[in-house]
Interface confidence: low
């Protein structure tokens, strides 16, 4: 974690890295390790991969503890074999339209990715394709049973996944602000990104949050009782403490968490909040980190396509974020 | 007490190979890097390189072509070899133990180049 | 990878001094301190931005923000005379600032 003690390293010869990822010297120039790679956690001890223009982002001082392997200023993105220069905006696909800063590249859906819950009178609706439209729209499969359970006051339920248009105009700016990326993890700590320029200067800048989707020991199907499909946000039963490379959150959280779906489709957070937490390290500092906090999740068969290079990459956003 | 003796020549001519040895005593040899920094007359220190219990190296880039560091666990020694000497690496030639910073040094060695 | 330090200061008996040492970024790493007395070896005085080790007198005293790392001697005696060096890793190699001078008049 800091290198205030003498090298513990495993016995040489050095690890065995993958492919195109470099064997660098430990942050206490102490033991020779994997360097992390583009949007990965760092800490001194993890350093990121300097041969590809990598450093370790902690953010404000104080909080140097953990980082996350950021692209130096003004590096260009690689995307579906396209290389795009640092403030370049590019379309995807007439799905999104994009950004790259600094190595990294954020993304605004042009379809809406809203999601449509089940209700009486639409218990199956259905994203499809429709001949000569980009943006895939929602259809109701005819329910088996054509009895209408309960008065049918609405056509459906669309939750409405926006706030505010993202697009604002202040003081000669043009506001735009990407939606949150798919935590990089599905279980466990992991790191969500996205690209704003909702600042002072109005300068595009990348901003990362940790996210936790479902803790990597939950056996959550097991808990789905018999004859439900799902348990779309099952609450952790007891406050948990969070951990991040060895340093454990000050506080306890009643965190929601996102469950699965045993028919095939895809359980994901819906709408997300981010909120700070203190964390505590054993040397006795603490760091101040962004998280991501989930109120809903969803199940829907919205899931990413292997063809859909941005959506097998990002294959799910966080809507309705309130920071 | 940690303490870190070194020796070697003093005196070099021109395209001549530097070479000094460096002595732990009353220490764990097997947990750090074993550096070794210079300093010219009157200037800053320069990091050279160093070795790790299992010989593994890090050597500065602008050094690393003629730079050799060794080590020999049996004796709790380390070594440095410096190739094709010149002028400019006259300096004063410091061992030093290393985790994250450089804990202990050696007493120095004054080496000068001349022909 | 370059670290910038002022070249000399002067402080007076019992007073504070503070020495900065500049680099990119040197924030994000963790910044040491070396004192080095005329004739003498380097001994080191504060490690990762603000530790001392054992030994050395609780009027030093080490942070690192921003691109700026200071060391602070408060209460400064004659024998705190003496070259000081900052130093710092980056990319694998250690680096060196080019020292700053403290006579204590």
């Known amino acids: 974690q800091n290198c205030s003690g003498p090298c513990r390293c495993p016995d040489e010869p050095a690890p065995r890295c993958p492919a195109g990822v470099s064997l660098v010297l430990d942050g206490c120039g102490c033991c020779r390790v994997c360097a992390k790679q583009l949007g990965e956690l760092c800490t001194e001890r993890d350093p990121c991969d300097p041969h590809k223009g990598l450093f370790c982002h902690f953010g404000s001082p104080a909080n140097r503890k953990i980082g996350v392997c950021t692209a130096k200023d003004g590096a260009p993105c690689i995307f579906g074999g396209t290389v795009y220069r640092s403030g370049e905006s590019f379309q995807s696909s007439c799905k999104y339209q994009c950004t790259c800063l600094d190595g990294a590249v954020g993304c605004m859906p042009l379809c809406s990715m809203d999601v449509r819950l089940p209700s009486p009178d639409c218990p199956f609706p259905r994203r499809v394709k429709l001949p000569g439209k980009c943006c895939e729209e929602w259809v109701c499969d005819e329910p088996k049973d054509q009895t209408v359970v309960g008065p049918a006051l609405a056509a459906y339920r669309l939750e409405d996944t926006f706030g505010p248009d993202p697009t604002m105009i202040r003081a000669n700016c043009l506001v735009q602000t990407t939606e949150w990326s798919a935590c990089s993890k599905t279980c466990g700590m992991g790191i969500s990104t996205r690209v704003t320029n909702d600042n002072a200067s109005c300068r595009l800048e990348k901003q990362s949050r940790l996210c936790m989707v479902r803790p990597c020991e939950a056996d959550l199907e097991e808990n789905i009782k018999k004859g439900k499909k799902c348990i779309r946000t099952p609450k952790i039963s007891k406050p948990i403490k969070f951990e991040l490379s060895g340093c454990t959150s000050m506080k306890t959280y009643r965190a929601k968490f996102c469950g699965v779906c045993t028919d095939g489709r895809c359980c994901t957070p819906h709408r997300t909040t981010t909120l700070p937490v203190e964390f505590k390290c054993p040397d006795g500092e603490v760091m101040k980190k962004n998280m991501m906090f989930i109120k809903t999740c969803a199940c829907h068969y919205n899931c990413p396509g292997d063809n859909d290079i941005f959506e097998s990459l990002y294959y799910r956003k966080m809507y309705g974020d309130m920071a | 007490q940690v303490q870190l003796q070194q020796w070697g020549a003093g005196l070099l001519k021109p395209s001549e190979t530097l070479s000094l040895t460096c002595a732990l005593y009353d220490g764990s040899f097997s947990d750090y890097y074993w550096s070794w920094i210079r300093q010219p007359p009157g200037k800053g220190l320069e990091w050279i390189g160093e070795?790790?219990?299992?010989?593994?190296?890090n050597y500065n880039p602008s050094l690393k072509s003629r730079v050799t560091v060794s080590v020999d666990t049996s004796k709790n020694q380390f070594s440095l070899k410096l190739r094709s000497m010149t002028a400019a690496d006259t300096a004063v030639y410091y061992c030093?133990?290393?985790?994250?910073?450089?804990?202990?040094w050696g007493q120095g060695t004054t080496v000068t180049v001349s022909s | 990878y370059v670290l910038t330090q002022p070249p000399s200061v002067s402080v007076s008996p019992g007073q504070t001094v503070s020495i900065t040492c500049s680099g990119d970024?040197?924030?994000?790493?963790?910044a040491s301190w070396y004192q080095q007395r005329p004739g003498q070896s380097p001994i080191l005085v504060i490690y990762?931005?603000?530790k001392r080790p054992s030994g050395i007198p609780e009027r030093f005293s080490g942070s690192n923000s921003g691109n700026t790392a200071t060391l602070t001697i408060s209460g400064t005696q004659a024998m705190d005379e003496a070259d000081y060096y900052c130093q710092a890793w980056d990319s694998n190699t250690a680096f060196f600032g080019a020292g700053t001078k403290v006579t204590v008049l």
């Open positions: 990762q931005d603000t």
């Open positions: 030093a133990r290393r985790y994250g910073s450089f804990e202990y």
């Open positions: 070795v790790n219990r299992s010989g593994g190296t």
């Open positions: 970024k040197l924030g994000n790493k963790y």
